[in-house]
């Protein structure tokens, strides 16, 4: 444990002021694993003035950082870059004259306490005022800054000319594009101080490249992948005071593909499981032995899980018999194309010939998600119906 501090497996605390610490506490090699430290509490350390870029990086599991009644004057911009779990920071009663948004912009902080610091009134700390104004009143802190006359001004009253939140404006609010095509998005930003502009594309799969000047930018996405449908693309404007973003949702249209079709499995119903991808939502039609399968309450399509442009479901059959054995074909189509796949199903043998289920189709339990029916497309056609399945099979079992 660092000299003048105490440690447990998950906590470091340094509160004894004499002789105190002069640098941020670091664990000795072969001691406690720094990744397991979730809380660091530092108090009364008047000679602790700086948090350097690499002081905190080893504590990747850190959730609570408290440095109070100490001498903290400077925090390096990238000090908390590796501490994505940080939730609470308390820098009460230190010697901070300025503090940048950049320290915290990547963190999802639920608490940042800065009371009792001698902040200098400038645009550099306007973001703190903006943050305060965004919070509900019970959380507001009594923050002050020193003006040119060394007078304490409540941060809530701080007015700095040419110091405000930026704005971002994306040209295309609604974006629908066909798979394989390319698009260019344009964005303009404004503000004083002049903001930086960047694109936040998340985990976009499609190839993309951007060009940005100070206040204008474009993003070109080429050979758009169907995997990017539903993803959000944001243009972000950021300056000292804060950030603004304008976002667009990408909708990609593409022809259906049946990515999964398997032999029947039995749970409390028989199920021919399938997965279909497509956008717009494909219409589904089943064929039995080459003829249209007319769905009924005994044989029907159920969609159990919808994952944006992917649909997982079953052709559900209640108590099928030997009469339902045969070839089942699924056709999925939308305006961009169609796909089809076929499987052979054997539910039971002919009476007196084959008394059990075909060993090629064992009773594997299929996970039925139990959602309400979400049929895609209208597959009803009363001609050429196949036999209904509301019978008990000859072995006396009910499926």
């Amino acid at each position: 444990c660092p000299t003048s501090c105490k440690c447990s497996a998950s906590r470091i605390w340094c509160s004894d002021p004499s002789p105190g610490i002069v640098a941020f506490p670091r664990l000795e090699p072969n001691s406690v694993d720094p990744e397991n430290i979730t809380e660091i509490f530092i108090a009364n350390q008047k000679r602790l003035e700086i948090i350097n870029e690499d002081d905190v990086e080893a504590y990747v599991g850190l959730r609570n950082l408290t440095i109070v009644d100490s001498g903290l004057k400077f925090v390096a911009h990238k000090a908390f870059l590796k501490n994505s779990n940080l939730q609470h920071i308390n820098f009460t009663r230190n010697k901070l004259t300025s503090l940048s948004r950049k320290h915290f912009r990547h963190l999802d902080l639920s608490e940042l306490i800065l009371v009792g610091n001698p902040f200098t009134c400038s645009c550099d700390i306007m973001w703190i005022k903006t943050l305060q104004e965004a919070k509900s009143s019970p959380d507001t802190q009594d923050l002050y800054c020193l003006n040119e006359s060394s007078k304490n001004i409540p941060l809530a009253n701080l007015q700095i000319p040419n110091c405000g939140l930026p704005s971002a404006n994306l040209a295309a609010p609604n974006l629908t594009v066909e798979e394989g095509k390319s698009i260019t998005l344009s964005c303009s930003v404004a503000g004083d101080p002049v903001p930086n502009m960047y694109w936040d594309v998340g985990n976009l799969v499609s190839k993309h490249m951007n060009e940005t000047s100070h206040t204008q930018g474009s993003l070109r996405i080429t050979n758009i992948s169907s995997d990017d449908s539903g993803k959000q693309i944001s243009c972000v404007a950021e300056n000292l005071v804060g950030e603004d973003q304008d976002s667009v949702n990408l909708t990609v249209h593409f022809a259906p593909t049946i990515t999964f079709l398997e032999s029947p499995t039995s749970d409390h119903h028989w199920c021919i499981p399938f997965t279909v991808k497509g956008n717009p939502k494909p219409a589904l039609q089943w064929f039995y032995n080459g003829a249209i399968l007319n769905e009924s309450k005994y044989i029907c399509t159920k969609i159990h899980v919808t994952n944006h442009t992917e649909y997982h479901g079953c052709l559900q059959l209640d108590n099928p018999t030997h009469m339902n054995n045969g070839d089942y074909t699924l056709i999925a189509k939308n305006e961009y194309g169609k796909d089809e796949k076929q499987i052979s199903a054997h539910f039971m043998g002919w009476p007196g010939i084959d008394d059990g289920a075909n060993p090629n189709y064992p009773d594997v339990i299929y996970e039925d998600y139990g959602t309400a029916a979400n049929d895609i497309g209208d597959t009803t056609n009363r001609s050429n119906e196949i036999p209904s399945t509301d019978v008990t099979d000859k072995t006396g079992r009910e499926h």
């Epitope: 000299t3 003048s4 105490k6 605390w13 509160s15 004894d16 002021p17 004499s18 002789p19 105190g20 009364n44 008047k46 000679r47 009644d69 001498g71 010697k95």
Partner: antibody
Framework: EVQLVQSGAEVKKPGESLKISCKGS????????IGWVRQMPGKGLEWMGI????????RYSPSFQGQVTISADKSISTAYLQWSSLKASDTAMYYC?????????????WGQGTLVTVSS | QSVLTQPPSVSVSPGQTASITCSGD??????ASWYQQKPGQSPVLIIY???KRPSGIPERFSGSNSGNTATLTISGTQAMDEADYYC?????????FGTGTKLTVL
């Protein structure tokens, strides 16, 4: 060499005011906390409070809060302990103490003590 | 503010080991120091940060601290060790001394 030199013994009457001093030398006076300790005749040691001369941040033990004032003048490297109205029960030896050094050396230093006698 | 409790007196024969305890709520979470005071003298720090000895303090003085108890151990006690001993710890906003123990070497 680190030294704390305290002012001389005082004899006072109840109700009078008093300010005793502790001058530090041989170390950075503004960079370390200085504390005051009371020892009444035949009794144990009691922490009264501490001060950080660099910014005058002061902490008092609950039983001494409001009874005494701890202050420091960094320009002359001197800490003070004062009473606005002495009582007979304030009769004691008062020590100032500092811990200015790094671990591994002698890490605290005490003044020689100031004897305060309050009697009518 | 927490109270640090010590036995009022401990007696030991020369050459034997003396142990003086100091009890306080969650004392093991704080650093304990030990002071020796002889009549008419200022206190002298003999143990700091639970178990560290300042230079010039004999090896026969050792310390430990866990749970709610800190312990000062004097092995091979000598007549010159007869004195008052005080534990001390930082408690939230200031230091606290223990009630003090008079060590008598028989």
């Amino acid at each position: 060499e680190v030294q704390l030199v305290q002012s001389g013994a005082e004899v006072k009457k109840p109700g009078e005011s008093l300010k005793i001093s502790c001058k530090g030398s041989g170390y950075s006076f503004t960079s370390y906390w200085i504390g005051w300790v009371r020892q009444m005749p035949g009794k144990g040691l009691e922490w009264m409070g501490i001060i950080y001369p660099g910014d005058s941040d002061t902490r008092y033990s609950p039983s001494f809060q409001g009874q005494v004032t701890i202050s420091a003048d960094k320009s002359i490297s001197t800490a003070y302990l004062q009473w606005s109205s002495l009582k007979a029960s304030d009769t004691a030896m008062y020590y100032c103490v500092v811990r200015p050094a790094a671990a591994g050396t002698r890490i605290d230093y005490w003044g020689q003590g100031t004897l305060v006698t309050v009697s009518s | 503010q927490s109270v640090l409790t010590q036995p009022p007196s401990v007696s030991v024969s020369p050459g034997q080991t003396a142990s003086i305890t100091c009890s306080g709520d969650k004392l093991g979470d704080k650093y304990a120091s030990w002071y020796q005071q002889k009549p008419g003298q200022s206190p002298v720090l003999i143990i700091y940060q639970d178990n560290k000895r300042p230079s010039g303090i004999p090896e026969r003085f050792s310390g430990s601290n866990s749970g709610n108890t800190a312990t000062l151990t004097i092995s091979g006690t000598q007549a010159m060790d007869e004195a008052d001993y005080y534990c001390q710890a930082w408690d939230s906003s200031t230091y606290v001394f223990g009630t003090g123990t008079k060590l008598t070497v028989l």
